[in-house]
């Protein structure tokens, strides 16, 4: 006997095939022998079964011999044997209808649990394999669960589900709710203007919730909260900000900060925090604000760096077009008698310069 | 709820082969059967032909020498081909779904065929 | 091939008018009969299948019946919305075929 899997909610064809390739009697049946349709003349009549009014023939493959049956909006009870009676011989038609659904909501939070469930026919014993978007593959019988959600598992999910050497594919889209970054660092000269950009790293119709920046100068011994604000339907408003600091916020996404200005005693890490409506948890982002500064003071010239720096970072005083250079591994490096000319401040990663400032020497006579 | 969207060129030249793509998103791929169908301007409907998921085709004879329907499944996607056009080809193309009747139907695409 | 012959090829009418659209069929196709509405540059609506069952959505002013060859489309009381092309098909063999169509205009 045929083996057809389906899908819940989804449509199957059943095939029956006559060898005469002309239109013919036949009808379809169910195990419990009730007729689900068949033709009178060149009519499709249905009988009483519950699947009547969800059942279909093509009329036009008729002529070809071909009496398929089709079951729209397919239910999980659907399953069952089915009988195609014509020329006088039986075809039978095993179906097999699986569901696999989510358990919760498919838009989770970072370090959320995604479980997804399988629906199957009584006596069957199908197995499903599931791969993320990131190539992922988690096995499992009549669950699956992922503990983690991580951002890149956000995307379709393809599960595929065995049953008798045959199988059916589900795509799920799971949005993980995450910004775009776990972690950010602005390196700015002092007095500069400094932009944060939290960009979220997905898309909703309606984004309603609230937020708070709370945050760590690194000459504190607290943190404080620099502004709160909340978001209705991709709209933000502040409701509270500090006096020092006084931050400003952009009013659409992506959420945007502007410092006025880059001072030692704002650097520091800052933590973003996001509660979004309907959801429990909340969405973080992590931000670092690095300032340099550099200065001549007599006979003395300086330059140094405030806020969370990595030990591998390199800090150099260097003399523009000169050999003359002193570099550190250290948050401050200087210069005494500094010879006369443009002086460059530079905090490097490997080579890579992070922030310069310049300074200019000018002779003492 | 089950969307048609279709899209190719929309100017040939004699001779020339035109070439339509229609995506299904929503609704089942699998059960159904999907349909070209094509209007003249200011005249009426031509059926073209028609495609399953595992690629089995039926054909209106009057084009049958110069059409190929495909089907992509992974993509839920299938095509119309139709060689050596002419004048009389200038239509707008629909793709629907069919099991005995058309619908819902993609949103239609201007061809013209011009030299 | 069925060829499928409508009638009238145009028709003039007033809101809340009663207008019937025929269809013929060139052989028998029982029910196998569908009602189509398209409005300019738009594609095609099915309105009625099995020459009498209702798509979901569709008015009850409009109605179907027939089998065999002679099948009727009636709108009951016609409303702005409705002054539009209206199409028969027939899904009885390939291949489908298709009436040249009645348009439906404002008098």
């Known amino acids: 006997k045929k083996v057809v899997l389906g899908k819940k909610g989804d449509t199957v064809e059943l095939t029956c095939n006559a060898s005469q390739k002309k239109n013919t009697q036949f009808h379809w049946k169910n195990s419990n022998q009730i007729k689900i349709l068949g033709i009178q003349g060149l009519f499709l009549t249905k009988g009483p079964s519950k699947l009547s009014d969800r059942a279909d023939s093509r009329k036009s493959l008729w002529d070809q011999g071909c009496f398929s049956m089709i079951i729209k909006n397919l239910k999980i009870e659907d399953s069952d044997t089915y009988i195609c009676e014509v020329e006088n011989k039986k075809e039978e038609v095993e179906l097999l209808v699986f569901g696999l659904t989510a358990n919760s909501d498919t838009h989770l939070l970072e370090g959320q649990s995604l479980t997804l469930t399988l629906e199957s026919p009584p006596g069957s014993s199908p197995s499903v394999k599931c791969r993320s978007p990131g190539g992922k593959n988690i096995q499992g019988g009549r669950t699956i669960s992922v503990p983690q959600l991580e951002r890149q598992d956000s995307g379709t999910w393809t599960c595929t589900v065995s049953q008798d050497q045959k199988t059916v594919e589900f795509k799920i889209d799971i949005v993980v709710l995450a910004f775009q970054k776990a972690s950010s660092t602005v390196y700015k000269k002092e007095g500069e203007q400094v932009e944060f950009s939290f960009p979220l790293a997905f898309t909703l119709e309606k984004l309603t919730g609230s937020g708070e920046l709370w945050w760590q100068a690194e000459r504190a011994s607290s943190s404080k909260s620099w502004i709160t604000f909340d978001l209705k339907n991709k709209e933000v408003s502040v409701k509270r900000v500090t006096q020092d600091p006084k931050l400003q916020m952009g009013k659409k996404l992506p959420l945007h900060l502007t410092l006025p200005q880059a001072l030692p005693q704002y650097a520091g890490s800052g933590n973003l925090t996001l509660a979004l409506e309907a959801k429990t948890g909340k969405l973080h982002q992590e931000v670092n604000l690095v300032v340099m500064r550099a200065t001549q003071f007599q006979e003395n010239l300086t330059c140094e760096v405030w806020g969370p720096t990595s030990p591998k970072l390199t800090l150099s005083l260097k003399l523009e077009n000169k050999g003359a250079t002193v570099s550190k591994q250290a948050k401050a490096v200087w210069v005494l008698n500094p010879e006369a000319g443009m002086w460059q401040c530079l905090l490097s990663d490997s080579g890579q310069v992070l922030l310069e400032s310049n300074i200019k020497v000018v002779p003492t006579w | 709820q089950v969307q048609l969207q279709q899209w190719g060129a929309g100017l040939l030249k004699p001779s020339e082969t035109l070439s339509l793509t229609c995506a299904v998103y929503g609704g089942s791929f699998s059960g159904y059967y999907w349909s070209w169908i094509r209007q003249p301007p200011g005249k009426g409907l031509e059926w073209i032909g028609e495609i399953n998921h595992s690629g089995s085709t039926n054909y209106n004879p009057s084009l049958k020498s110069r059409v190929t329907i495909s089907v992509v499944t992974s993509k839920n996607q299938f095509s119309l081909k139709l060689s050596s056009v002419t004048a009389a080809d200038t239509a707008v193309y629909y793709c629907?779904?069919?099991?005995?009747?058309?619908?819902?139907w993609g949103q239609g695409t201007l061809v013209t065929v011009s030299s | 091939d069925i060829q499928m012959t409508q009638s009238p090829s145009s028709v003039s009418a007033s809101v809340g008018d009663r207008v019937t659209i025929t269809c013929r069929a060139s052989q028998d196709i029982a029910d196998w009969l569908a009602w189509y509405q398209q409005k300019p540059g738009k594609a095609p609506k099915l309105l009625i299948y099995a020459a009498s069952s209702f798509q979901s959505g569709v008015p009850s002013r409009f109605s179907g019946s027939g089998s065999g060859t002679d099948f009727t489309l009636t709108i009951s009381s016609l409303q702005p919305e409705d002054f539009a092309t209206y199409f028969c098909?027939?899904?009885?063999?390939?291949?489908?075929?298709f009436g040249q169509g009645t348009k439906l205009e404002i008098k």
């Open positions: 629907a779904r069919v099991l005995n009747w058309f619908d819902p």
């Open positions: 098909q027939q899904a009885n063999s390939f291949p489908y075929t």
